[in-house]
């Protein structure tokens, strides 16, 4: 069951998933000047059986220099045209192994992919929040949100996180400080970004991520 909407937006915070439940869909979108190959997949899908999970299909982009069915709608500032260098140059990681049963890892980047990754989450997915650079986390409970099914409708739980404007940031374990506004976007566009291409799931984290992850960050 797909979740009807995105996880909640928290001012001055971003969210990310550590692993993706089977059934999660990822849009195959291409950066400007490129398009999906003819009859190419619109999505990748996390599928699997009891032993392992993997992403089916492959997103493929090709140059749109020739006449095609993709148009740029509005010109973008130069800095928005490319993903952050650190993301595009991240090491390829196996996509057929998940750190948790029934979950897929972050798919490796594909050539000329779009600047954003757009996921469609399923019921039971958990995402974790962090404050952007320049903000410090005050938390009254878990800095996470779970997609739940209630009375036949899906909803995301509200993360108990407030980001205050102090020059200190709360980070995901093992990750460098995030940029305050990824790819130069205004703050209003950053509160619900999932920029996880360069994130590698750490095995030691996976065992605890459903329970005590980030607790040391907020104590």
């Amino acid at each position: 069951e797909l979740c009807d909407d995105d996880p909640p937006e928290i001012p001055h915070a971003t969210f990310k998933a550590m692993a993706y439940k089977e059934g999660t869909m990822l849009n195959c979108e291409c950066k400007r000047g490129f398009r999906r190959i003819k009859s190419g997949s619109l999505y990748m899908l996390c599928t699997g059986n009891s032993s392992h999970s993997s992403w089916d299909n492959q997103c493929q982009c090709t140059s749109s220099a020739t006449r095609n069915t993709t148009k740029q709608v509005t010109p973008q500032p130069e800095e928005q045209k490319e993903r952050k260098t650190t993301e595009m140059q991240s090491p390829m990681q196996p996509v057929d192994q998940a750190s948790l049963p029934g979950h897929c890892r972050e798919p490796p980047p594909w050539e000329n992919e779009a600047t954003e990754r757009i996921y469609h989450f399923v019921v039971g997915q958990m995402v974790y929040y962090q404050c952007v650079q320049g903000y410090r986390a005050l938390h009254r409970g878990p800095a996470e949100s779970v997609c739940k099914m209630t009375h036949g409708k899906t909803r995301w739980t509200q993360p108990q996180l407030i980001c205050t404007g102090e020059m200190e940031t709360s980070q995901f374990p093992g990750e460098e400080k995030p940029q305050a506004s990824p790819e130069g976007r205004p703050e209003s566009e950053t509160s619900c970004l999932v920029t996880t291409t360069d994130f590698q799931i750490q095995t030691e984290m996976a065992a605890t991520m459903e329970t005590s992850i980030f607790t040391t960050e907020y104590q």
Epitope: D5, D6, R36, K71, Q72, V73
Partner: antibody, heavy 115, light 108 residues
């Protein structure tokens, strides 16, 4: 619950253009595809194209490539579909719909092309 | 493009009966990306099923979807008077997104 509200009916002359709007309320706008579909009187559904507002990139069915432009204004949560060089066979109800498994749909906009 | 062919074109049944609508795709691999819609005269279509078998929010459980590969089925287990309408299948796994031509479900 997300709702899509479209602009009102239009009567156009052959050769002119029409621009239909689709305003979203009650949910995430910029991260989900907004699709445009049309239905001629007594006919089936025909996909025209889609846009993902946050990426500002649209793609189109080959049939409409040269005549349609889909745009989105993230500040007002509104998507637009402009169809140019109208002809009588473009008379149809035009729908917007969210996500690629279309849910929900706008109420539809009747565009009549007549001289 | 992935062409969808629906059958039958028209299905005549009585309330209380079981309806089985078919949709065949020209290309396989669309099983996770197949949707079904219901449309009544003068109304916008309504999503019934996505992902071949997942019911959309608020859809009664008498509607069910099944199938994989290239052959898909929408089943209405026990027809209610309000179920008589036109039904469309749609694939959204590859571009262009395509629809079947529709099946008209009419009262016998």
């Amino acid at each position: 619950q997300v709702q899509l509200v479209q602009s009102g009916a239009e009567v156009k002359k052959p050769g002119s253009s029409v621009k239909v709007s689709c305003k979203a309320s009650g949910g995430t706008f910029s991260r989900y595809a907004i699709n445009w579909v049309r239905q001629a009187p007594g006919q089936g559904l025909e996909w025209m194209g889609r846009i993902i507002p946050i990426l500002d990139i649209a793609d189109y069915a080959q049939k409409f490539q040269d005549r349609v432009t889909i745009t989105a204004d993230k500040s007002t949560n509104t998507a637009y579909m402009e169809l140019s060089s109208l002809r009588s066979e473009d008379t149809a109800v035009y729908y917007c719909a969210r996500k690629d498994w279309f849910d929900p749909w706008g109420q539809g906009t009747l565009v009549t092309v007549s001289s | 493009e992935n062409v969808l062919t629906q059958s039958p074109g028209t299905l005549s049944l009585s309330p209380g009966e079981r309806a089985t609508l078919s949709c065949r795709a020209s290309q396989s691999g669309s099983s996770s990306y197949l949707a079904w819609y219901q449309q009544k005269p003068g109304q916008a279509p309504r999503l019934l099923i996505y992902g071949a078998s997942s019911r959309a929010t608020g859809i009664p459980d008498r509607f069910s979807g099944s199938g994989s590969g290239t052959d898909f089925t929408l089943t209405i287990s026990r027809l209610e008077p309000e179920d008589f309408a036109v039904y469309y299948c749609q694939q959204y796994g590859s571009s262009p997104i395509t629809f079947g031509q529709g099946t008209r479900l009419e009262i016998k």
